[in-house]
Protein backbone atom coordinates (compact mmCIF):
# COMPACT_ATOMS: atom_id res chain seq x y z
CA UNK A 1 0.00 0.00 0.00
CA UNK A 2 1.26 3.75 -0.51
CA UNK A 3 1.36 3.90 3.52
CA UNK A 4 3.73 0.94 3.49
CA UNK A 5 5.72 2.53 0.49
CA UNK A 6 6.10 5.87 2.61
CA UNK A 7 6.98 4.05 5.66
CA UNK A 8 9.71 2.11 4.06
CA UNK A 9 11.32 5.08 2.12
CA UNK A 10 10.96 6.87 5.40
CA UNK A 11 12.93 4.24 7.21
CA UNK A 12 15.32 4.18 4.45
CA UNK A 13 15.81 8.04 4.20
CA UNK A 14 15.91 8.16 8.44
CA UNK A 15 18.50 5.25 8.28
CA UNK A 16 20.93 7.29 5.36
CA UNK A 17 20.16 10.86 7.31
CA UNK A 18 21.85 8.98 10.70
CA UNK A 19 24.62 6.88 8.73
CA UNK A 20 25.34 9.99 7.12
CA UNK A 21 25.55 12.30 10.61
CA UNK A 22 27.63 9.11 12.55
CA UNK A 23 29.98 8.92 9.26
CA UNK A 24 30.70 12.78 9.55
CA UNK A 25 31.12 12.93 13.21
CA UNK A 26 33.84 10.15 12.97
CA UNK A 27 35.85 11.96 10.45
CA UNK A 28 35.81 15.31 12.16
CA UNK A 29 37.59 14.20 14.71
CA UNK A 30 40.00 12.57 12.51
CA UNK A 31 43.17 14.79 11.93
CA UNK A 32 42.47 17.42 8.66
CA UNK A 33 44.58 15.13 6.41
CA UNK A 34 44.49 16.08 2.93
CA UNK A 35 43.32 11.78 3.33
CA UNK A 36 40.85 12.70 5.69
CA UNK A 37 39.53 15.24 3.70
CA UNK A 38 39.12 13.27 0.82
CA UNK A 39 37.68 10.59 2.61
CA UNK A 40 35.22 12.86 4.08
CA UNK A 41 34.36 13.82 0.96
CA UNK A 42 33.73 10.67 -0.41
CA UNK A 43 31.33 9.27 2.28
CA UNK A 44 29.07 12.49 2.08
CA UNK A 45 29.16 11.72 -1.54
CA UNK A 46 28.31 8.02 -1.44
CA UNK A 47 25.30 8.66 1.02
CA UNK A 48 23.62 11.30 -0.95
CA UNK A 49 23.99 9.18 -4.69
CA UNK A 50 22.64 6.39 -1.97
CA UNK A 51 19.94 8.74 -1.62
CA UNK A 52 19.71 9.30 -5.19
CA UNK A 53 19.71 5.42 -6.11
CA UNK A 54 16.50 4.69 -3.22
CA UNK A 55 14.39 7.29 -4.49
CA UNK A 56 15.01 5.97 -8.31
CA UNK A 57 14.97 2.34 -7.33
CA UNK A 58 11.60 2.94 -4.97
CA UNK A 59 10.19 2.67 -8.21
CA UNK A 60 11.30 -0.63 -9.51
CA UNK A 61 10.40 -2.44 -6.66
CA UNK A 62 6.95 -4.42 -6.89
CA UNK A 63 4.61 -2.16 -4.67
CA UNK A 64 2.99 -4.56 -1.90
CA UNK A 65 -0.07 -5.01 -3.60
CA UNK A 66 1.54 -6.52 -6.54
CA UNK A 67 3.31 -9.31 -4.23
CA UNK A 68 1.84 -12.57 -2.76
CA UNK A 69 -1.64 -12.73 -1.47
CA UNK A 70 -1.10 -14.07 2.19
CA UNK A 71 -3.79 -17.15 1.29
CA UNK A 72 -4.17 -18.69 -1.87
CA UNK A 73 -7.63 -18.25 -3.46
CA UNK A 74 -8.42 -21.53 -3.63
CA UNK A 75 -8.07 -22.06 0.39
CA UNK A 76 -10.40 -18.66 0.21
CA UNK A 77 -14.53 -19.02 0.55
CA UNK A 78 -15.98 -18.59 -2.67
CA UNK A 79 -17.83 -15.61 -3.91
CA UNK B 1 -13.90 -24.49 -7.90
CA UNK B 2 -12.08 -21.80 -8.75
CA UNK B 3 -12.24 -20.72 -12.18
CA UNK B 4 -10.95 -17.48 -14.52
CA UNK B 5 -12.28 -17.80 -18.04
CA UNK B 6 -10.85 -15.68 -20.45
CA UNK B 7 -13.19 -13.60 -23.44
CA UNK B 8 -12.84 -11.20 -25.90
CA UNK B 9 -9.97 -11.94 -27.98
CA UNK B 10 -9.94 -12.63 -31.57
CA UNK B 11 -7.93 -10.63 -35.08
CA UNK B 12 -7.71 -6.95 -35.30
CA UNK B 13 -5.54 -4.88 -37.75
CA UNK B 14 -2.87 -3.44 -36.41
CA UNK B 15 -4.15 0.29 -34.91
CA UNK B 16 -7.47 -1.34 -33.88
CA UNK B 17 -8.86 -2.09 -30.29
CA UNK B 18 -9.75 -4.99 -28.07
CA UNK B 19 -11.43 -5.29 -24.77
CA UNK B 20 -10.57 -8.15 -22.76
CA UNK B 21 -12.42 -9.95 -20.34
CA UNK B 22 -11.75 -12.11 -17.02
CA UNK B 23 -14.99 -13.60 -15.53
CA UNK B 24 -13.23 -15.00 -12.04
CA UNK B 25 -15.63 -17.31 -9.83
CA UNK B 26 -15.36 -19.72 -6.93
CA UNK B 27 -13.21 -17.86 -4.84
CA UNK B 28 -13.79 -14.11 -3.49
CA UNK B 29 -12.44 -12.29 -6.39
CA UNK B 30 -12.54 -8.69 -4.19
CA UNK B 31 -9.55 -9.66 -2.07
CA UNK B 32 -7.11 -10.56 -4.39
CA UNK B 33 -5.00 -8.49 -6.96
CA UNK B 34 -4.85 -9.54 -10.58
CA UNK B 35 -2.69 -9.35 -13.59
CA UNK B 36 -2.20 -9.87 -17.25
CA UNK B 37 -0.08 -11.90 -18.78
CA UNK B 38 0.79 -13.20 -22.19
CA UNK B 39 2.49 -15.38 -24.46
CA UNK B 40 3.91 -14.62 -27.36
CA UNK B 41 4.07 -17.03 -30.67
CA UNK B 42 7.54 -18.26 -30.02
CA UNK B 43 6.09 -19.22 -26.37
CA UNK B 44 8.16 -16.67 -24.22
CA UNK B 45 5.69 -15.51 -20.95
CA UNK B 46 5.68 -11.49 -20.32
CA UNK B 47 3.98 -9.79 -17.69
CA UNK B 48 1.51 -7.38 -19.19
CA UNK B 49 -0.16 -5.36 -16.31
CA UNK B 50 -1.48 -5.85 -12.62
CA UNK B 51 -4.17 -4.12 -10.47
CA UNK B 52 -4.35 -3.78 -6.85
CA UNK B 53 -7.72 -4.84 -4.89
CA UNK B 54 -9.81 -1.88 -5.30
CA UNK B 55 -8.42 -1.08 -8.45
CA UNK B 56 -6.28 2.07 -7.37
CA UNK B 57 -3.17 0.77 -7.99
CA UNK B 58 -2.36 -0.42 -11.29
CA UNK B 59 1.14 -1.14 -13.08
CA UNK B 60 2.31 -1.99 -16.98
CA UNK B 61 5.03 -2.97 -18.84
CA UNK B 62 6.23 -0.41 -21.03
CA UNK B 63 5.37 -1.66 -24.05
CA UNK B 64 2.10 -1.29 -23.59
CA UNK B 65 1.35 2.22 -21.20
CA UNK B 66 -0.28 4.69 -23.04
CA UNK B 67 -1.85 2.02 -24.89
CA UNK B 68 -3.58 -0.39 -22.61
CA UNK B 69 -5.39 0.20 -19.14
CA UNK B 70 -6.16 -2.72 -16.67
CA UNK B 71 -9.34 -2.03 -14.69
CA UNK B 72 -11.88 -4.11 -12.54
CA UNK B 73 -15.57 -4.41 -11.73
CA UNK B 74 -15.78 -6.22 -8.46
CA UNK B 75 -19.51 -6.10 -8.12
CA UNK B 76 -18.96 -8.11 -11.44
CA UNK B 77 -16.06 -10.67 -10.21
CA UNK B 78 -14.81 -9.60 -13.56
CA UNK B 79 -11.22 -8.09 -14.71
CA UNK B 80 -10.50 -6.46 -17.84
CA UNK B 81 -7.92 -5.14 -20.61
CA UNK B 82 -8.66 -2.42 -22.82
CA UNK B 83 -6.09 -2.89 -25.51
CA UNK B 84 -5.70 0.31 -27.96
CA UNK B 85 -3.51 1.05 -31.12
CA UNK B 86 -2.42 -2.84 -31.17
CA UNK B 87 0.70 -3.68 -33.10
CA UNK B 88 1.77 -6.43 -34.71
CA UNK B 89 4.36 -7.28 -31.74
CA UNK B 90 0.98 -7.45 -29.16
CA UNK B 91 -0.06 -11.01 -30.70
CA UNK B 92 -0.53 -13.30 -28.22
CA UNK B 93 -2.40 -15.98 -25.89
CA UNK B 94 -3.57 -13.63 -23.11
CA UNK B 95 -3.98 -14.77 -19.29
CA UNK B 96 -5.70 -13.92 -16.19
CA UNK B 97 -3.86 -14.24 -13.54
CA UNK B 98 -4.09 -14.33 -9.95
CA UNK B 99 -1.32 -11.91 -8.30
CA UNK B 100 1.27 -14.53 -7.20
CA UNK B 101 0.63 -16.73 -10.55
CA UNK B 102 -1.25 -19.29 -8.26
CA UNK B 103 -3.97 -19.76 -11.10
CA UNK B 104 -4.42 -18.87 -14.26
CA UNK B 105 -6.87 -18.65 -16.79
CA UNK B 106 -7.37 -20.84 -19.59
CA UNK B 107 -6.48 -17.82 -22.38
CA UNK B 108 -7.79 -16.04 -25.20
CA UNK B 109 -5.83 -15.31 -28.57
CA UNK B 110 -5.35 -12.04 -29.75
CA UNK B 111 -3.84 -11.61 -33.41
CA UNK B 112 -3.09 -8.22 -34.78
CA UNK B 113 -2.41 -8.24 -38.49
CA UNK B 114 -3.71 -6.76 -41.59
CA UNK C 1 14.62 -5.61 -16.36
CA UNK C 2 15.80 -7.91 -14.15
CA UNK C 3 16.94 -11.16 -16.64
CA UNK C 4 16.12 -14.45 -15.80
CA UNK C 5 18.35 -17.10 -17.86
CA UNK C 6 17.07 -21.24 -17.33
CA UNK C 7 19.53 -23.60 -18.46
CA UNK C 8 19.45 -26.14 -19.74
CA UNK C 9 17.07 -24.84 -22.61
CA UNK C 10 15.79 -28.91 -23.16
CA UNK C 11 16.70 -31.84 -21.55
CA UNK C 12 15.66 -35.70 -21.76
CA UNK C 13 15.44 -37.55 -19.05
CA UNK C 14 14.55 -41.43 -18.58
CA UNK C 15 12.01 -42.11 -15.99
CA UNK C 16 13.11 -42.64 -12.30
CA UNK C 17 15.87 -40.10 -12.92
CA UNK C 18 16.36 -37.14 -11.11
CA UNK C 19 16.67 -33.84 -13.48
CA UNK C 20 17.72 -30.12 -12.28
CA UNK C 21 16.78 -26.81 -14.07
CA UNK C 22 19.20 -23.55 -13.22
CA UNK C 23 17.81 -19.72 -13.06
CA UNK C 24 19.87 -17.12 -12.62
CA UNK C 25 18.86 -13.63 -12.29
CA UNK C 26 20.95 -10.34 -13.34
CA UNK C 27 19.98 -8.77 -9.99
CA UNK C 28 19.25 -9.99 -6.12
CA UNK C 29 16.38 -10.97 -6.00
CA UNK C 30 15.27 -9.90 -2.15
CA UNK C 31 12.52 -8.00 -1.82
CA UNK C 32 12.84 -4.81 0.73
CA UNK C 33 10.33 -6.63 2.91
CA UNK C 34 12.77 -9.47 3.17
CA UNK C 35 10.89 -12.15 1.05
CA UNK C 36 12.09 -13.49 -2.15
CA UNK C 37 9.79 -13.81 -4.94
CA UNK C 38 11.39 -16.69 -7.12
CA UNK C 39 8.63 -18.86 -9.22
CA UNK C 40 8.64 -22.09 -10.74
CA UNK C 41 6.16 -22.90 -13.38
CA UNK C 42 5.06 -25.45 -15.48
CA UNK C 43 3.44 -25.64 -18.72
CA UNK C 44 2.25 -28.91 -19.73
CA UNK C 45 1.30 -29.52 -24.11
CA UNK C 46 -1.67 -27.22 -24.71
CA UNK C 47 -2.20 -26.49 -21.27
CA UNK C 48 -2.17 -23.09 -19.47
CA UNK C 49 0.97 -22.68 -17.12
CA UNK C 50 0.16 -23.71 -13.35
CA UNK C 51 2.57 -22.54 -10.53
CA UNK C 52 4.41 -25.50 -9.06
CA UNK C 53 7.28 -23.48 -6.51
CA UNK C 54 6.55 -20.29 -4.91
CA UNK C 55 9.08 -17.69 -2.86
CA UNK C 56 12.11 -20.16 -4.00
CA UNK C 57 10.92 -23.22 -1.81
CA UNK C 58 7.62 -23.38 -0.70
CA UNK C 59 5.52 -25.81 -3.16
CA UNK C 60 2.07 -25.53 -3.87
CA UNK C 61 -0.76 -27.49 -2.50
CA UNK C 62 -1.06 -30.72 -4.49
CA UNK C 63 2.12 -30.48 -5.98
CA UNK C 64 4.17 -33.97 -5.16
CA UNK C 65 7.66 -33.44 -3.14
CA UNK C 66 9.67 -34.55 -5.57
CA UNK C 67 10.08 -30.61 -6.85
CA UNK C 68 12.11 -29.06 -4.74
CA UNK C 69 13.42 -25.47 -5.19
CA UNK C 70 16.16 -24.18 -3.56
CA UNK C 71 18.23 -21.11 -3.69
CA UNK C 72 18.77 -17.13 -2.82
CA UNK C 73 20.20 -14.04 -3.87
CA UNK C 74 20.92 -14.73 -8.01
CA UNK C 75 21.00 -18.43 -8.02
CA UNK C 76 18.15 -20.74 -8.00
CA UNK C 77 17.31 -24.31 -8.60
CA UNK C 78 14.42 -26.78 -9.37
CA UNK C 79 14.97 -29.92 -9.11
CA UNK C 80 12.75 -33.10 -9.65
CA UNK C 81 13.63 -36.17 -8.52
CA UNK C 82 12.04 -39.55 -9.77
CA UNK C 83 11.15 -38.18 -12.64
CA UNK C 84 7.95 -39.59 -14.00
CA UNK C 85 5.81 -38.97 -17.81
CA UNK C 86 3.70 -36.80 -16.56
CA UNK C 87 6.24 -34.24 -15.72
CA UNK C 88 7.10 -33.25 -19.24
CA UNK C 89 6.18 -30.10 -20.08
CA UNK C 90 8.08 -26.51 -20.45
CA UNK C 91 9.33 -25.05 -16.55
CA UNK C 92 9.38 -21.43 -16.72
CA UNK C 93 11.04 -19.50 -13.67
CA UNK C 94 9.37 -16.27 -12.67
CA UNK C 95 10.24 -13.03 -10.38
CA UNK C 96 8.10 -10.61 -8.79
CA UNK C 97 10.43 -8.88 -6.65
CA UNK C 98 10.79 -5.82 -9.81
CA UNK C 99 8.48 -4.26 -11.98
CA UNK C 100 8.61 -5.62 -14.49
CA UNK C 101 7.89 -8.79 -13.33
CA UNK C 102 10.04 -11.34 -15.87
CA UNK C 103 10.21 -15.02 -16.86
CA UNK C 104 12.94 -16.99 -17.95
CA UNK C 105 13.19 -18.18 -21.42
CA UNK C 106 11.79 -21.72 -20.20
CA UNK C 107 13.40 -25.05 -19.95
CA UNK C 108 11.81 -28.08 -22.28
CA UNK C 109 11.94 -31.78 -20.30
CA UNK C 110 11.16 -34.43 -22.03
CA UNK C 111 10.88 -38.05 -20.79
CA UNK C 112 12.69 -40.55 -22.95
Known amino acids: SEAEDASLLSFMQGYMKHATKTAKDALSSVQESQVAQQARGWVTDGFSSLKDYWSTVKDKFSEFWDLDPEVRPTSAVAA | QLQLVESGGGLVQPGGSLRLSCAASGFTFGTYSMRWVRQVPRKALEWVSSISTDGGGTAYRDSVKGRFTISRDNAKNTLYLQMNNLKPEDTAIYYC???????WGQGTQVTVSS | DVVLTQTPGSLSVVPGESASISCKAG???????????LYWLLQKPGQSPQRLIYQVSNRDSGVPDRFTGSGSGTDFTLKISGVKVEDAGVYYCAQGTYWPKTFGQGTKLEIK
Open chain 2, 97 to 103: VIAGYSD
Open chain 3, 27 to 37: QNLVHPDGKTY
